[in-house]
């Protein structure tokens, strides 16, 4: 059994171990226990062998389970006495009744047990433990009282423990030997003095935490144990615990407020105040950061820090920015010389830091303000814009010139420059919304960008944008089209120079629109023809003048075509129109369908004035009879040397009609051989008859032509066989077969066609065509109408 006296406290459990060694008997040993109170004999207490061994007093306690034997090995046992009482103080003897056959050594051993009254008082035991509500960084202390009135020299040990849910942690312990032991995770805080354990008076033990952390939340217990020294060894005689308090760490209230909307003039100072509201009044230190974002969301990338006041009150800021504080609750951001780039959203970010152990700091609260929307208003340049048209088109293709003038009253300084944008808006035809089209826009660096409408025409040089004076911007359309008609306006932008030498647009001023318009009336072209000498005879010169007038045609030039409408013998057929001679807008003459080789120089067309033309036809013939007209086309200049047809008009007709009682000629065909055999001679007569005035045969001449529609091609056009002109010259067409042709005048009015050695191809229908020529009184030959 243990050699030292065992000391226990009333109500605790007494456990005495006993073991036997160096024996020869059975391996499982039996043990008897006896008890002797001071000065009395031993009384049987319990046995592992003999059921009837215990005295009556102990039988009941054994049955109740207050006393029991627990075998721990074959050679060892423990005596357990629960709820030990003062009457249990005395000597306990353990013996082995059946170890060896012969006595060899010590078969019993005795240990003294002292039972002390419970003189350990631990508190507070009154009331359930209080709940301490505090904030992170705040101090707290807990007290536990422990006192022992033991007559023996005992030491107390104390442990502070915190429970958080199922987890249990040791905070700080004071051992019975007077040593402090910080729990796991509390070492640093203990060594820095943040967590301390000390005594107050003779029996109070104080746990002090100078800076509460969120991890300090939980239920705190004070565990007190009482120790006694027996023969140089310390043994714990009892332990008591008490719930002291529940610590709740409340989150700190922290709010940062900035003005919602602020307007500041360009170049002035922006002064924003961040007001802090907090329930912390202890030695927490604020860290204030002002940041800026283009968007009303401080979490988005692109947010940048402008200034920061750290917890040591040191300011870190960017140029033109200052941060100051009037008091611990008000922080000013000052941005000097603001410009447009300072427009945006400003945030105040506040962190509260509480001092921790070893000069460390920990954040106890954090807040970000709502954004302060800052708008930078301009010290606007004061100017007006006037647009006027220095050239207004009267017609399509005329030039248009617009001048956009800046009348600037207060913006002469070097840090303001002007640029222009030109816009076009179609004339409204209805209530439909008509959007403006950008023609050109000038950037702050005066680079010009064209709109879709004007890109190509600007590249072609038709649209010209220029700046001819410091205060005037010009826009020229070289050739204005009908599509260009509409409203034009200019927008002059003022640009302000920034600190970084960039230019930022500060104002736009719109001109009133200028309407470019001309009446799109139809072009009118009127041509009047007249005959200066209305009466003339065949052989005389025919003269006709054409006078042209026009409206709504710009810078017209005229081209003229003389045309004749000649009657055809068959009344059911339309008249035949012949183009005779023309004169283009550059006064170049061209013979059209004038085919009379003998009269190549017989027609003349000339420009008398810009709007008057004269046609002359020399040595007129009866065959020239007909209706004569001028067809006039008006042309407008386009792009320099090019011309655009503007209108065409026909003059009234001038008639050439020879009123004569001259002869009437007829022609007929006769053949003596209407049926022939191949190889025979075919004889065909063209006989002319003259009615009316008798003519001298010398005053008559004829052009005679023979045609045939051969039997092998009755559906074909007639084929010219041979002709004899009025001067007696015979012309014969080439033939693909062997027969020959001859044509001769056999009398004044008879012409004979002979086919020699006729072949099958010569069979068919033959006819003659006669053009009479009659000598006029003036001696000129007049061509008569062709007869068949």
């Amino acid at each position: 059994v243990p050699t030292a006296t065992l000391v226990r406290v009333v109500g605790t459990e007494l456990v005495i171990p006993c073991n036997v060694s160096d024996y020869d008997g059975p391996s499982e040993q039996n043990f008897d226990w006896s008890f002797s109170s001071l000065g009395s004999s031993f009384v049987e207490l319990a046995s592992t062998w003999e059921v009837g061994f215990p005295a009556q007093l102990y039988q009941e306690r054994l049955q109740r389970g207050e006393i029991l034997l627990r075998r721990t090995a074959n050679d060892a046992v423990e005596l357990h006495i629960k709820n030990v009482q003062p009457s249990d103080q005395g000597h306990y003897k353990c013996s082995t009744p059946s170890t060896d056959a012969t006595v060899q050594g010590n078969y019993e051993d005795t240990v003294q047990v002292k039972v002390l009254a419970d003189s350990l008082h631990v508190g507070p035991s009154a009331r359930p433990p209080p709940s301490l509500s505090l904030r992170e960084g705040e101090p707290f202390e807990l007290r536990c009282t422990a006192a022992s009135a033991s007559p023996l020299h005992t030491h107390l040990a104390l442990l502070w423990e915190v429970h958080r849910g199922p987890a249990r942690r040791s905070v700080l312990a004071l051992t019975h030997e007077g040593r402090f032991h910080p729990g796991l995770g509390y070492e640093q805080r203990y060594h820095s003095g943040d967590v301390r354990l000390d005594t107050v008076g003779s029996d109070a033990y104080r746990l002090s935490v100078s800076r509460a952390l969120s991890a300090d939340q939980g239920s705190y217990r004070c565990i007190v144990s009482e120790w006694i020294a027996e023969q140089g060894n310390w043994q714990e005689i009892q332990e008591k615990a008490v719930e002291v308090a529940t610590v709740v760490i409340q989150p700190s209230v922290l709010r940062a407020a900035v003005p919602k909307n602020v307007s500041v003039a360009e170049g002035k100072e922006l002064d924003l105040t961040c007001n802090i509201t907090t329930d912390r009044a202890d030695d927490v230190r604020p860290e204030v950061t002002w940041s800026f974002s283009r968007m009303p969301d401080s979490t988005l990338p692109g947010s940048r820090v402008l200034a920061r006041l750290d917890r040591d009150s040191l300011v870190h800021s960017s140029p033109h920015v200052a941060l100051s504080h009037v008091d611990a609750r008000s922080y000013h951001l000052l941005v000097r010389d603001v410009s447009k780039e300072n427009s945006g959203y400003y945030y105040c970010h506040v962190s509260l830091w509480a001092p921790g152990h070893n000069r460390s700091w920990h954040k106890v609260a954090e807040a970000v303000s709502s954004p302060a929307g800052v708008g930078v208003t301009w010290l606007e340049p004061d100017y007006q814009v006037y647009l006027n048209a220095s050239k207004v088109p009267g017609f399509a293709d005329d030039p248009t010139e617009l001048a956009c003038r800046v009348v600037d009253t207060k913006s002469g300084e070097a840090n303001v420059r002007f640029t222009v944008s030109w816009y076009y808006r179609m004339n409204r035809r209805s209530d439909n919304v008509v959007t403006s089209e950008l023609l050109a826009v000038m950037d702050g660096d005066w680079t010009l960008k064209y709109g879709e409408r004007s890109k190509q025409r600007a590249q072609d040089g038709d649209f010209i944008f220029s700046k001819e004076h410091t205060d005037t911007f010009n826009f020229r359309i070289q050739r204005t089209t009908e599509e260009d008609r509409g409203n034009y306006y200019c927008v002059v932008s003022a640009w302000t120079k920034q600190r970084n030498n960039s230019w930022v647009k500060s104002k736009d001023v719109f001109s009133k629109p200028v309407n470019i318009f001309w009446a799109l009336e139809d072009s009118v072209l009127v041509v009047k023809a007249r005959q200066p000498k209305p009466f003339f005879a065949a052989g005389n010169t025919f003269e006709m003048t054409c006078k042209v007038s026009s409206k709504n045609i710009k810078s017209p030039r005229y081209s003229v075509l003389i045309m004749a409408e000649k009657p055809v013998g068959d009344l059911s057929s339309p008249n035949e129109t012949k183009y005779i001679i023309s004169l283009d807008q550059d006064s170049v003459v061209k013979l059209e369908n004038w085919t009379d080789a003998s009269r190549v120089d017989g027609v003349v067309l000339e420009k008398v004035q810009e709007d008057e033309f004269r046609y002359r036809m020399y040595q007129t013939q009866v065959s020239d009879a007909g209706l004569y007209r001028c067809m006039v086309t008006a042309w407008s200049p386009v792009r320099g040397s090019l011309w655009r047809e503007a209108a065409t008009s026909l003059s009234n007709p001038i008639e050439i009609d020879f009123q004569t009682s001259g002869p009437i000629f007829n022609a007929s065909v006769h053949s003596d051989t209407p049926s022939v055999i191949r190889g025979d001679l075919i004889k065909l007569f063209c006989i002319i008859t003259v009615e009316g005035a008798a003519l001298d045969p010398d005053d008559m001449a004829f052009d005679v032509s023979w045609f045939a529609v051969h039997s092998f091609g009755l559906d074909k056009a007639p084929v010219l066989l041979s002709s004899l002109d009025r001067k007696g010259i015979v012309t014969t067409s080439r033939r693909d077969w062997k027969s020959d042709l001859s044509l001769e005048r056999v009398s004044v009015l008879e012409f004979l066609l002979q086919v020699h050695g006729s072949e099958d191809q010569d069979f068919g229908n033959y006819y003659c065509s006669v053009t009479p020529w009659v000598k006029s009184p003036t001696g000129s030959w007049q061509k008569e109408a062709e007869i068949h």
């Epitope: 008082h121 035991s125 009331r127 359930p128 009282t145 029996d203 109070a204 008490v242």
Partner: antibody
């Protein structure tokens, strides 16, 4: 038989400090089993708990009065005290001291009326 | 803080008749240790309060057995089986489960009809 007796001035001027002492007889104030409390009752009104102290020095106060209250203990004299500063007419009341155990407030003093008036 | 609300605030009773006072708490008074720390006090005219009941239903020594307490969670009741003349006064409930602060009800005045 445990007895508690309040003592102190019955009249206090506004803005001054109200000071009361509770003397405990028939038992030790240094018992680990008890808290020592102060309660007040304005005339014609209900009871309001002010605060408590444990002999080891732990104090707990009503948050509504915390900034103005101090409770202390003198174990050698078996007394505990109340100090309430910056008083106003609203602090006029009968002030009671009491013993608190795990079952509540079992013993009360007979109370003392403190009037705040200039 | 836990708010204690008593009803009725005034209770006129005929001698010999039963009386019942209700006390309701703003949160449960069950402590983590399983106990409910609720007291009932009697304050006779011109006297200090005297504890009648502790831990909801336990009568203090010397308190007549006509007084009984009951309830759980947030609803508690003090019953007087037969009212006697000496029972006249103001009755208060008090909780010390969740403290600080210890809180009282506003009081119920019992008077004889």
């Amino acid at each position: 038989q445990l007895q508690l007796q309040e003592s102190g001035p019955g009249l206090v001027k506004p803005s001054e400090t109200l000071s009361l002492t509770c003397t405990v007889s028939g038992g030790s104030i240094s018992s680990s089993s008890y808290y020592w409390d102060w309660i007040r009752q304005p005339p014609g009104k209900g009871l309001e708990w002010i605060g408590t102290i444990y002999y080891g020095g732990s104090t707990y106060y009503n948050p509504s009065l915390k900034s103005r209250v101090t409770i202390s203990v003198d174990t050698s004299k078996n007394q505990f005290s109340l100090k309430l500063n910056s008083v106003t007419a609203a602090d006029t009341a009968v002030y009671y001291c009491a013993r608190g155990n795990s079952y509540g407030l079992d013993y009360w003093g007979q109370g003392t009326l403190v009037t705040v008036s200039s | 803080d836990v708010v204690m609300t008593q009803s009725p605030l005034s209770l006129p009773v005929t001698l010999g008749q039963p009386a019942s006072i209700s006390c309701r708490s703003s949160q449960s008074l069950v402590h983590s240790d399983g106990n409910m720390y609720l007291n009932w006090f009697q304050q006779r005219p011109g006297q200090s309060p005297r504890r009648l009941i502790y831990k909801v239903s336990n009568r203090d020594s010397g308190v007549p057995d006509r007084f009984s307490g009951s309830g759980s969670g947030t609803d508690f009741t003090l019953k007087i089986s037969r009212v006697e003349a000496e029972d006249v006064g103001i009755y208060y409930c008090m909780q010390s489960t969740h403290w600080p602060p210890v809180t009282f009800g506003q009081g119920t005045k019992l008077e004889i009809k």
